[in-house]
């Protein structure tokens, strides 16, 4: 019998209100055994996969999706989903990213390496089929 997959969670570092030009990292978290995390934006219209998944604790895996320089177009709703073969999980709750005008230049220098995933993609109709493979591998490019 296949296990029920717990819903992932999503958070943003350093927060959900980000000055224009600053960086933000979305953190997706799930259970042990996750193979791929997907960060979806605005009801699956765009998404980004990473297979760079680490075990943060004995019970929780995580992946990080980094935007180096936030633009106004990055504002919106984001959520996570994960692939634990042979099933996709349910989606996390939405997290809303707000972008505010900054009074000065970009904020302080980066303080975290933050792994990065590949380029934005349009999902195919089966992007959440239980047997859809991870849609791409690791690339040293940044989101959006």
């Amino acid at each position: 019998q296949e296990e029920d997959l717990p819903r992932p969670s999503i958070s943003a570092e350093p927060g959900t209100v980000i000055p224009l030009g600053s960086h933000v990292t979305f953190v997706c978290r799930g259970p042990v055994g996750v193979q791929t995390f997907r960060l979806e934006r605005d009801s699956r219209s765009t998404y980004n996969d990473t297979e760079d998944v680490s075990q943060a604790s004995p019970s929780e895996s995580e992946a990080r999706f980094r935007i180096d320089s936030v633009r106004e177009g990055n504002a919106g709703l984001y959520r996570c989903i994960y692939y634990k073969p042979p099933k996709w999980s349910e989606q996390s709750d939405y997290l809303e990213l707000l972008v505010k005008e900054s009074s000065g230049g970009p904020d302080s220098p980066d303080t975290e390496p933050g792994s990065s995933a590949g380029p934005t993609q349009r999902p195919s109709d089966n992007s959440h089929n239980e047997h859809a493979p991870a849609s791409q591998g690791l690339k040293a490019e940044h989101l959006y």
């Epitope: 042990v32 193979q35 680490s54 004995p58 047997h131 493979p133 040293a140």
Partner: antibody, heavy 116, light 110 residues
Framework: EQSVEESGGRLVTPGTPLTLTCTAS????????MCWVRQAPGKGLEWIGL?????STAYASWANGRFTISRTSTTVDLKITSPTSEDTATYFC????????????WGPGTLVTISS | ELVLTQTPASVSEPVGGTVTIKCQAS??????LAWYQQKPGQPPKQLIY???NLASGVPSRFKGSGSGTEFTLTISDLECADAASYYC????????????FGGGTEVEIK
Amino acid sequence: EQSVEESGGRLVTPGTPLTLTCTASGFTISDYHMCWVRQAPGKGLEWIGLIRASHSTAYASWANGRFTISRTSTTVDLKITSPTSEDTATYFCARYGGSGIGCNLWGPGTLVTISS
Amino acid sequence: ELVLTQTPASVSEPVGGTVTIKCQASQSIDSNLAWYQQKPGQPPKQLIYAVSNLASGVPSRFKGSGSGTEFTLTISDLECADAASYYCECTYYGNSYVGGFGGGTEVEIK
């Protein structure tokens, strides 16, 4: 019952490329990352590399250039590009179980002997 | 490059005793650690994953602990069937570094 099995191990002369093949039963191999590990006679386990479901690869630093891992929809291959006597070992294929789990479903191994 | 150092290389303990095997990582690997048992002529068998989770069918005499760079496998109430080699594995193969296996520990039961 889920299982993996290696094939292709044999005696070859130094410098002769050799390809080992891993097949799966009871699960769809293309859904999973797959690992290759070797063990020389009387020695410990050596992780060679891994191929992800997306076909991207990762290798141990010592194995880079000496081995090539590839996959089709039904198999995962390990090519030993230019074997030397030091590559004599039992070669294991294993399914990667996901974050925190590692290479947890192993085949019985296939013996490769490099000798002139 | 990540290095996993296992100690001791070998150990001998009586039936009913306890064995402690240490695995030290050259950098923090969070909870990306598993433990394996291997007997001659057989492939490795997973005992512990994600530091402290018991693999299916493994008795609770096997216990994993640790975090960051220092990890421990403890086998209590030793049985003759526990005579084997034991290996730790860093299970992360991502962008930051790639894992691999420790050098192994041979456990003999007196």
